[in-house]
Amino acid sequence: MHVAQPAVVLASSRGVASFVCEYGSSGNAAEVRVTVLRQAGSQMTEVCAATYTVEDELAFLDDSTCTGTSSGNKVNLTIQGLRAMDTGLYICKVELMYPPPYYVGMGNGTQIYVIDPEPCPDSD
Amino acid sequence: MHVAQPAVVLASSRGVASFVCEYGSSGNAAEVRVTVLRQAGSQMTEVCAATYTVEDELAFLDDSTCTGTSSGNKVNLTIQGLRAMDTGLYICKVELMYPPPYYVGMGNGTQIYVIDPEPCPDSD
């Protein structure tokens, strides 16, 4: 299954990056799982994941670094709390869980660049 | 796809439990992903996951609680660092990632029992 996401995104000075993850619809996908993975070398680590249904809204865990909204076969993802050391390739994985058949697809990744802000000067 | 695993395993006094996860081979599976999930009520949490290829050995992340070896359609899984509170149902999920078609299957779970060792008496 084809998954599309932007090639590059620049995080805001507050360490927030947003991008859209779009998947090829099988039509009646009622339960969809979206996972954001960070690739470093040959290693992949899970950043966050959420399952949503055709009836209910996308919901990440309360303590997740991600938030998101879903609309049809598009998911708007926002990753917060990013620092320069988090610069890297973030891959969107989409699983059409239900009803059968199960489909899975991964995007080519979004390179997120994060620049730490300069510390504020001491006020006199 | 059928996945078989033992019903019950008793962890060693060092908190190590090993079991075999066997899947119905589709023959030419070149890339296989094995995930160990812990089921608590209706919740499932991922314990560890690894992808291996027909050419390379199974490799979990360095900081993973799991290690393993693969042989054909059998995977020998070892979970370390278990404590009594980790007693529960551990489900083996196998995904035949490549080549297509994609197959996925889950075992019925292995109930792992963990007994914390008695603390050693102070030596005089």
Partner: antibody, heavy 116, light 112 residues
Amino acid sequence: QIQLVQSGPELKKPGETVKISCKASGYTFTNYGMNWVKQAPGKGLKWMGWINTYTGEPTYADDFKGRVAFSLETSASTAFLQINNLKNEDTATYFCARRGVRLDYWGQGTTLTVSS
Amino acid sequence: DVLMTQTPLSLPVSLGDQASISCRSSQSIVYISGSTYLEWYLQKPGQSPKLLIYKVSSRFSGVPDRFSGSGSGTDFTLKISRVEAEDLGVYYCFQGSHVPWTFGGGTKLEIK
């Protein structure tokens, strides 16, 4: 509001064909699968299968493979159940029901009587 | 196929009583996603079935909170805390985890 409205009662002879319709309104038709359920007189519910309203691909329960066919007229947001070569045991009420992760809205049912 | 067995077949109750209906599946109905697609429906005479509970314990909108679902794996229960006259009818469990999806045989809730 969401509604599924089915066609009226049918009286058929053995060997004939029937086509029952289920018209959906109040939601995006192609976002939800359409299921069909049979209920023989005085009996329980039996799942017949479902059709993917986006791709048109049907899935049939084993007991309903062969003489039963699901189809769509997407432009009219309508699903159809056709039963060929009718038999007496096809006498029942047939329900359509939409499904995402639950059968949340049902048609009113269509009663089919097969009698010579 | 997954066989769904409901007990009892008939459940005579007095209004205001608690009622409990059991549904047992012939195999685990946990789907590969980890979700369990176990639902409960009520059918009143001459009407279409109505959804009460989905995914084991989630109450559908508009369903009174006297209805609750519980269970896991192969054993599931629907409880009605205080039966009212409008609750009478036939209750069906349904599994949507493994194709073919299947209904239980039904439990008739009636006045004692």
